[in-house]
Interface confidence: low
């Protein structure tokens, strides 16, 4: 699997990875105790037929061509975990593993 | 995880997982030995903000609102496979199971 | 080394039906997609169909679908093309051409060998 | 179906000349485009696949280019042998289709 990786300054139009720190503090999420922030990065860009498909239905889907279809679109295609402390709803403290976290590559589904 | 269901006579605009039948000899993809056609189904609707969003990695994106990132799209998040008989690139004739063929389900990421 | 070799030019009157030969050899006849193109005197190229000789699969071009029928004998390593129906303007050269497939998606492909044709004139 | 429109219909040039043939689909079919050369009383034989790959066997003198809708085949230093009639082919989808060729004349 491939996918690109951009930056603020990149002038590619297409589908590619950017990078965002996510803020708890500053979204006021203070239920997560740690970590405070995390790079998350997020996904943008066009998707133009072939480009970057992730599944071989993505294409077929494109060739039949049904009512509303929309053409696929730029999302996360691989994502990783990661570890955080934080309150559940029964304000205990918690250590776990949160399943897709942070995208490590983009593609278009 | 939950998913909307549609067919083509539903009046729901949010996004949901409609039926198609792919057909590898309208195609013209002789390469495939069998199935000629299967129930590959799509992904079409719009994402309101939280509706069916599979990551919380959604959710944050949406909240930090880079540059250019676009809302959330209906996109497949449950796939599974389907087993074919087909050509490689040799002309060899393998049977083989193809994943993310068909989609289970479908939600906003 | 690989060849088609297709049978010889035929004469029929309009309404009648005609069966082309392309024998293959050099090659496992099974694993490749045997394609049939026709031209007509001084004119272009135009597709006709394919068949898989490994289980008879075919495509029609919609042009044709209702005269012609593709078929393999896998003993002799032979295709068949058989057009029914003739008309002055199915007289045209029909050539058989193998399907070489270098890739993996659907039209990773190319004709990398031919028959040398057979003419067929279709005249009352 | 696809049409694929080919120009000029007819060319005339001389030995060593470098010259252009163009060929136009009516929708977009990728890179799904062949070229033939055919020789009076020939079968067709392919140059280029792929829109720009040569098959083997192919002198480098012959090269394809182009994708999406508008393809072209050139010939950087013409031969004798090299006087024929080409066509393209799309093999993006069925039925597939050609263009209605290009005779390349000795002027």
């Known amino acids: 699997d491939f996918g690109l990786d951009c930056d603020e300054h990149s002038t590619e139009s297409r589908c590619c990875r950017y990078p965002l720190t996510v803020d708890f503090e500053a979204f006021g999420w203070d239920w997560i105790i740690a970590p405070k922030r995390y790079k998350a990065n997020y996904c943008s860009g066009e998707c133009e037929f072939v480009f970057l498909q992730k599944y071989p239905h993505t294409h077929l889907v494109h060739q039949a061509n049904p009512r509303g279809s929309a053409g696929p679109c730029c999302t996360p295609t691989k994502m990783s975990p990661i570890n955080m402390l934080y309150f559940n709803g029964k304000e205990q403290i918690i250590y776990g593993k949160i399943p897709a976290m942070v995208v490590d590559r983009c593609g278009c589904s | 995880d939950f998913g909307l269901d549609c067919d083509e006579h539903s009046t729901e605009s949010r996004c949901c997982r409609y039926p198609l039948t792919v057909d590898f000899e309208a195609f013209g993809w002789d390469w495939i030995i069998a199935p000629k056609r299967y129930k590959a189904n799509y992904c079409s609707g719009e994402c309101e903000f939280v509706f069916l969003q599979k990551y919380p990695h959604t959710h944050l994106v949406h909240q930090a609102n880079p540059r250019g990132s676009a809302g959330p799209c209906c996109t497949p998040t449950k796939m599974s496979p389907i087993n074919m008989l087909y050509f490689n690139g040799k002309e060899q004739i393998i049977y083989g199971k193809i994943p993310a063929m068909v989609v289970d389900r479908c939600g906003c990421s | 080394q690989v060849q088609l070799v297709q049978s010889g030019a035929e004469v029929k009157k309009p309404g009648a039906s005609v069966k082309v030969s392309c024998k293959a050899s050099?090659?496992?006849?099974?694993?490749?997609?045997m394609h049939w193109v026709r031209q007509a005197p001084g004119q272009g190229l135009e597709w006709m169909g394919n068949i898989y000789p490994y289980n008879g699969v075919s495509n029609y071009n919609q042009r044709f679908k209702a005269r012609v029928t593709m078929t393999t004998d896998t003993s002799t390593s032979t295709a068949y093309m058989e057009l029914r129906s003739l008309r002055s303007d199915d007289t045209a050269v029909y050539y058989c051409a193998r399907r070489y497939y270098y890739g993996t998606g659907p039209a990773d492909w190319y004709f990398d060998v031919w028959g040398q044709g057979t003419l067929v004139t279709v005249s009352s | 179906d696809i049409q694929m429109t080919q120009s000029p219909s007819s060319l005339s040039a001389s030995v060593r000349d470098r010259v252009t043939i163009t060929c136009k689909a009516s929708?977009?079919?990728?890179?799904?485009l062949s070229w033939f050369q055919q020789k009076p009383g020939k079968a067709p034989k392919s140059l280029i696949y792929?829109?720009?790959r040569l098959v083997d066997g192919v002198p480098s003198k012959f090269s394809g280019s182009g994708s999406g809708t508008d393809f072209t085949l050139t010939i950087s230093s013409l031969q004798p042998e090299d006087f024929a009639t080409y066509y393209c082919l799309q093999c993006d989808e069925f039925p597939l289709t050609f263009g209605q060729g290009t005779k390349l004349e000795i002027k």
């Open positions: 050099g090659y496992s006849f099974t694993g490749y997609f």
């Open positions: 929708q977009d079919i990728n890179s799904y």
């Open positions: 792929r829109a720009n």
